[in-house]
């Protein structure tokens, strides 16, 4: 699996025309060092990419694999700007722990049995009433809202 | 293909300030975090610092001490590291690099470009 | 930071031969959450910059000959080369992306 040519999520803003030395972000910068917000903030920032990054690679595999016909004519569908509203019809109806599981459906167990074991062992626990602990933690990092609003606003597949 | 191209280093004195500028192609510039990673001779490798795509978080190495400044120009697909009150030992080879999918992984680095700090 | 400590500095290998190469972290790079080991290896040949060869531990970059695999959890990693050829004459660096990324002190790979 690549990482290479392949999107992050991407956000609306407009860039910056100023030049970097007179742009007002970087007058920032001084407060923020004497602040000493250094490596430790790093932490905690990577800390908040981890889950989201993961799921990102799932979406990528599935996408780079293109073994779903289903998941195509989803793409086609972005494309033509339909498939925004057509995941937030769907996420609405799904709780965390099912669209988790989707993400990963289909993946092919022989490919990636660790992802697929991982889901497997999140429904057995849900079923047992014992939720897991790497779903709350998912749940902690990402709430469902914010979760939802992030996958439809990463750019799933670039279409240069 | 994915080109990163660093340049601005050379040789300076102590005490002074150099910017360096890296020129990105081949990839959606403004949708990727992108860092500087630095190569001593003495040191080996050492990350220096990072920014987001949309410029709304910057990180730095404590080592710094808060001289070093990371930008970026996403209409100009350039990044930028003001460095200020340079000292011997920020002599190193200064690579660009992009971040994957996953944080703090680096997926392409540029050729890197050396900077030199001697009276 | 986590420290990562490569072992050896440097190494021998005659051509066709196997080459390993270890590395230890300061503390885990494990994620529980997805049972992923964020720990990458890079070659750096010389007067280039270093190249991508695998991360979350085991998994090869798009483009790297399957003579190289990556294997370990935890704090303790391996990089295999199966076959060495020519080609393979670097500087081999692990690097940890679980917090503020930080690299080993590079392996020097030689032909025996």
């Known amino acids: 699996r690549s990482l290479q040519d392949t999107e992050e999520k991407s956000r609306s803003f407009s860039a910056s025309q100023a030049d970097p030395l007179s742009d007002p972000d970087q007058m920032n910068e001084d407060k923020r060092h004497s602040q000493g917000t250094f490596t430790s903030d790093y932490s905690k920032y990577l800390d908040s990419r981890r889950a989201q990054d993961f799921v990102q690679w799932l979406m990528n595999t599935k996408r780079n694999r293109n073994n779903i016909a289903k998941r195509h004519d989803e793409f086609e569908r972005h494309a033509e700007g339909t498939f925004t509203s057509d995941v937030s019809s769907y996420l609405e109806g799904q709780a965390a722990k099912e669209f988790i599981a989707w993400l990963v459906k289909g993946r092919g167990r022989r490919d990636f049995p660790e992802e697929v074991a991982i889901v497997e062992e999140l429904g057995r626990r849900h079923a047992d009433g014992s939720f897991s602990d790497e779903m709350n933690t998912i749940l902690d990092n990402l709430a469902a809202r914010d979760f939802i609003n992030w996958l439809i606003q990463t750019k799933i597949t670039d279409r240069k | 293909q994915v080109q990163l191209v660093e340049s601005g280093g050379g040789v300076v004195q102590p005490g002074r300030s150099l910017r360096l500028s890296c020129a990105a192609s081949?990839?959606?510039?403004?949708?990727?975090?992108m860092h500087w990673v630095r190569q001593a001779p003495v040191k080996g490798l050492e990350w220096v610092a990072f920014i987001s795509n949309d410029k709304s978080n910057k990180y730095y190495a404590d080592s710094l001490k808060g001289r070093f400044t990371i930008s970026r120009d996403n209409s100009k697909n350039t990044l930028y590291l003001q460095m200020n009150s340079l000292t011997a030992e920020d002599t190193a080879v200064y690579y660009c690099a992009k971040e994957s999918i996953l944080a703090a992984l680096f997926d392409y680095w540029g050729q890197g470009t050396l900077v030199t700090v001697s009276s | 930071d986590i420290v990562m400590t490569q072992s050896p500095d440097s190494l021998a290998v005659s051509l066709g031969e196997r080459a390993t190469i270890n590395c230890k972290s300061s503390q885990s790079v494990l994620y529980s959450s997805n049972n992923k080991n964020y720990l990458a290896w890079y070659q750096q040949k010389p007067r280039q910059p270093p190249k991508l060869l695998i991360y979350w531990a085991s998994i090869r970059e798009s483009g790297v000959p399957d003579r190289f695999s990556g294997s370990g959890s935890g704090t303790d990693f391996t990089l295999t080369i199966s076959s060495l050829q020519a080609e393979d004459v670097a500087v081999y660096y692990c690097q940890q992306f679980y917090s503020v990324p930080t690299f080993g002190q590079g392996t020097k790979l030689e032909i025996k």
């Open positions: 081949g990839f959606t510039f403004s949708s990727y975090g």
